[in-house]
Amino acid sequence: QLPPGKPEIFKCRSPNKETFTCWWRPGTDGGLPTNYSLTYHREGETLMHECPDYITGGPNSCHFGKQYTSMWRTYIMMVNATNQMGSSFSDELYVDVTYIVQPDPPLELAVEVKQPEDRKPYLWIKWSPPTLIDLKTGWFTLLYEIRLKPEKAAEWEIHFAGQQTEFKILSLHPGQKYLVQVRCKPDHGYWSAWSPATFIQIPSDFTMND
């Protein structure tokens, strides 16, 4: 029987800068029941607070609701593991909520084959940003990535769209059915999951771009 091993806070995520959750990985339990507590203080403060919500994020997590979340302030947090034989502390983790946003996937993905008379045909892809993200304030810059592949292909073709919410693709295989998905990330944050796939049938008379 031993004191607990050192825990590690290994991930923090926010869907929208208004709330966030951090998760830790326990160290060894020393063969005894072990209690974990997360304490934190904000940059420039000395007053320590305990995690406000150990439930919402699941096991080994701390959730910070709206009233506990402030942007532009660094949170300095650590986890304490305690059993009958003693305690151990994680390294301190410095967290700025502005940098840990992982948005929901983009919405309303629409895909269409365009065949203008005077130009080469192309695949036109359009989407909307996720609803929880407020782009109007300028606090967010969302970057987008598209992936597509013929239905039976193994490899995805990836296109970086920057801040655009629409994109044209010229080189496609005629007669094939394609899957198209889009995802987004803040300029300093994490990629969303891919949106649900949209399927599009490429006409057999679609002319490949040179």
């Epitope: 590690e8 290994f10 940059e43 660094t74 983790l93 410095y94 940098y99 994490y190 990629w191």
Partner: antibody, heavy 120, light 107 residues
Framework: QVQLVQSGAEVKKPGSSVKVSCKAS????????MHWVRQAPGQGLEWMGE????????NYNQKFKDRVTITADKSTSTAYMELSSLRSEDTAVYYC?????????????WGQGTLVTVSS | DIQMTQSPSSVSASVGDRVTITCKAS??????VAWYQQKPGKAPKLLIY???NRYTGVPSRFSGSGSGTDFTLTISSLQPEDFATYYC?????????FGGGTKVEIK
């Protein structure tokens, strides 16, 4: 404890490439951005670029954009910096540096440095 | 790119002295400034982040202040182990840039 261990010194010819490695231990590699900073002999520090090891998303200093490639191998917790088309002014100590937290780019842990000498 | 201009480039001081190093940014950077200490042949070591926050384990004799474009690192009572070169760094906008360094030498 957190450690960043870099590969050994290199001597390279002008026009060639160098790839420096930085093996991380003592923390979860994918949690923090990793940066590369260089220092020419007797000179100051110059930021080259950064990578998020969780998804290999990277940003570069435009000064090096066409010559530098930063990669990360999650399976070995190792970051790499490759600099191509080497010239004598690329002679420097190259450091990897871990982001201080989940936040802006200040650097709390540094590798020991790798001296790259470019000479014909 | 944002230029970070440090002054002085070197300073001679004695143990116990108060030393002040300044850093001026060419554009507004808010409080997105860090300070590092570097000894010969070693990697830099973080002292201050967000202009005024001491990093874990950094002695209280080191303090940082300033916002906007003008920043200061102060060593309140210089110790023998503080003789080194000090760098400021901005992380407000890409590319992240460092000052030219200030060498603190023994008088």
């Amino acid at each position: 404890q957190v450690q960043l261990v870099q590969s050994g010194a290199e001597v390279k010819k002008p026009g060639s490439s160098v790839k420096v490695s930085c093996k991380a231990s003592g923390y979860t590699f994918t949690t923090y951005w990793m940066h590369w900073v260089r220092q020419a002999p007797g000179q100051g520090l110059e930021w080259m670029g950064e990578i998020d090891p969780s998804d290999s998303y990277s940003n570069y200093n435009q000064k090096f954009k066409d010559r530098v490639t930063i990669t990360a191998d999650k399976s070995t917790s190792t970051a790499y910096m490759e600099l191509s088309s080497l010239r004598s002014e690329d002679t420097a100590v190259y450091y990897c540096a871990r982001n201080g937290g989940l936040g802006p780019a200040w650097f709390s842990y540094w590798g020991q440095g790798t001296l790259v000498t470019v000479s014909s | 790119d944002i230029q970070m201009t440090q002054s002085p480039s070197s300073v001679s001081a004695s143990v116990g002295d108060r030393v002040t190093i300044t850093c001026k940014a060419s554009q507004y950077v808010g409080t997105a400034v860090a300070w590092y200490q570097q000894k010969p042949g070693k990697a830099p070591k973080l002292l201050i982040y967000s202009a005024s926050n001491r990093y874990t384990g950094v002695p209280s004799r080191f303090s940082g202040s300033g916002s906007g474009t003008d920043f200061t690192l102060t060593i309140s009572s210089l110790q023998p182990e503080d003789f080194a070169t000090y760098y400021c760094q901005q992380y407000s906008s890409y590319p992240w840039t460092f000052g030219g360094g200030t060498k603190v030498e023994i008088k």
